[in-house]
């Protein structure tokens, strides 16, 4: 029997290497059964996750999963950091793992590094 708990499918310690000035969509895959829960995004500030208010968000529906999307239009250097989505379901809060955005400011990068170059940076390796 399939569990009817809400589940948020963000991988633990996942990250995205993105560039300032580009558009970016941060997706929170949500599995639910009958009623779609209310989902929000927050940004980590130390141990506190600050709810993101007034941001452009949307839903995308696929076969077995819905995606709650946070839109960056465009990405700003200040968007660097860790984000978490959470769902309000039957008066309980279900929190996802956090996912980290590493923003490269194109003004300070002579050319866009490859994925392997991104991975070779110590601040990526040990974050």
């Amino acid at each position: 029997k399939e569990s009817c708990d809400v589940q948020l499918y963000i991988k633990r310690q996942s990250y995205h290497s993105i560039f300032a000035g580009d558009p970016f969509k941060l997706e929170c895959p949500v599995k639910y059964c009958a009623h779609r829960p209310q989902v929000t995004w927050c940004k980590l500030n130390g141990t506190t996750c600050v709810k993101l208010e007034g941001r452009h968000t949307s839903w995308k529906q696929e076969k077995n999963l819905s995606f709650f999307i946070l839109h960056f239009e465009p990405v700003l250097p200040s968007d660097n950091g860790s984000y978490r989505c959470s769902a309000n379901f039957l008066s309980a809060i279900i929190e996802s793992h956090s996912t980290t955005l590493y923003v490269t400011d194109v003004k300070s990068a002579s050319e866009r590094p490859s994925k392997d170059e991104m991975a070779s940076r110590p601040w990526l390796l040990y974050s």
Epitope: K11, S17, E95, K115
Partner: antibody, heavy 119, light 112 residues
Framework: QVQLVQSGAEVKKPGSSVKVSCKAS????????MYWVRQAPGQGLEWIGR????????RYAQKFQGRATITADESTSTAYMELSSLRSEDTAVYYC????????????WGQGTLVTVSS | DIQMTQSPSSLSASVGDRVTITCRSS???????????LNWLQQKPGKAPKRLIY???KLDSGVPSRFSGSGSGTDFTLTISSLQPEDFATYYC?????????FGQGTKLEIK
């Protein structure tokens, strides 16, 4: 059930490279992390690095930075680990493993690939 | 890097014995989500390692209930309540909290 099958044993010359493959079945690798660990003869386990097959981002232990390259091909559910500038100390059994990226609910290892570096 | 130190490095015991292996990390394994990502592996000669326990105390499916894990912060233990012949192997702890992942040096469990 989740299974991993690795490529066969290799004998390599010092200074050359080796590329080991690891094919997963029973799981969508987009939902996992795949990682590589080695074990020199009679020694303990040493973590090399891991990849997120959903986006291709890899992370490495500092010791292997610049010498190891981990990649994944989602279409064939296969991960690869290439190690360059081989030396005799790289002689080891290389294991790939896969685990659930969301809840760590499974962790499965391949059978291992013996890489011998000898002139 | 986080150092993982296991003790003892080898241990002789008999079938039916209760055995405890300890693992100490050089810093706390408590992650920001409130969980400690500490795993225990079993490896038999010539075979690949197999995970027995994850998140300190959760048993992998198919692992006999005589195996248990406990601990928090920096100190963890693997206990086998009543040794069976198939339990003689090498056991490793390893941490999945921080990069790079690191392993203990192993504990070889031998028949007395």
């Amino acid at each position: 059930q989740v299974q991993l099958v690795q490529s066969g044993a290799e004998v390599k010359k010092p200074g050359s490279s080796v590329k080991v493959s690891c094919k997963a079945s029973g799981v969508n690798i987009k939902d996992t992390y795949m990682y590589w660990v080695r074990q020199a003869p009679g020694q303990g386990l040493e973590w090399i690095g891991r990849i997120d097959p959903a986006n291709g981002y890899a992370r490495y232990a500092q010791k292997f930075q610049g010498r190891a390259t981990i990649t994944a091909d989602e279409s064939t559910s296969t991960a690869y680990m290439e190690l360059s500038s081989l030396r005799s100390e790289d002689t080891a059994v290389y294991y790939c493993a896969v685990y659930d990226g969301y809840y760590e609910s499974f962790d499965v290892w391949g059978q291992g690939t013996l890489v011998t570096v000898s002139s | 890097d986080i150092q993982m130190t296991q003790s003892p490095s080898s241990l002789s015991a008999s079938v039916g014995d209760r055995v405890t292996i300890t693992c100490r990390s050089s810093q706390s394994l408590l992650d920001s989500d409130g969980k400690s990502y500490l795993n225990w592996l079993q490896q038999k000669p010539g075979k690949a390692p197999k995970r027995l326990i994850y998140l300190v105390s959760k048993l992998d499916s198919g692992v006999p209930s005589r195996f248990s894990g406990s601990g928090s912060g920096t100190d963890f233990t693997l206990t086998i309540s009543s040794l069976q012949p198939e339990d003689f192997a090498t056991y490793y702890c390893w941490q999945g909290t921080l990069f790079p992942r690191t392993f203990g040096q192993g504990t070889k469990l031998e028949i007395k």
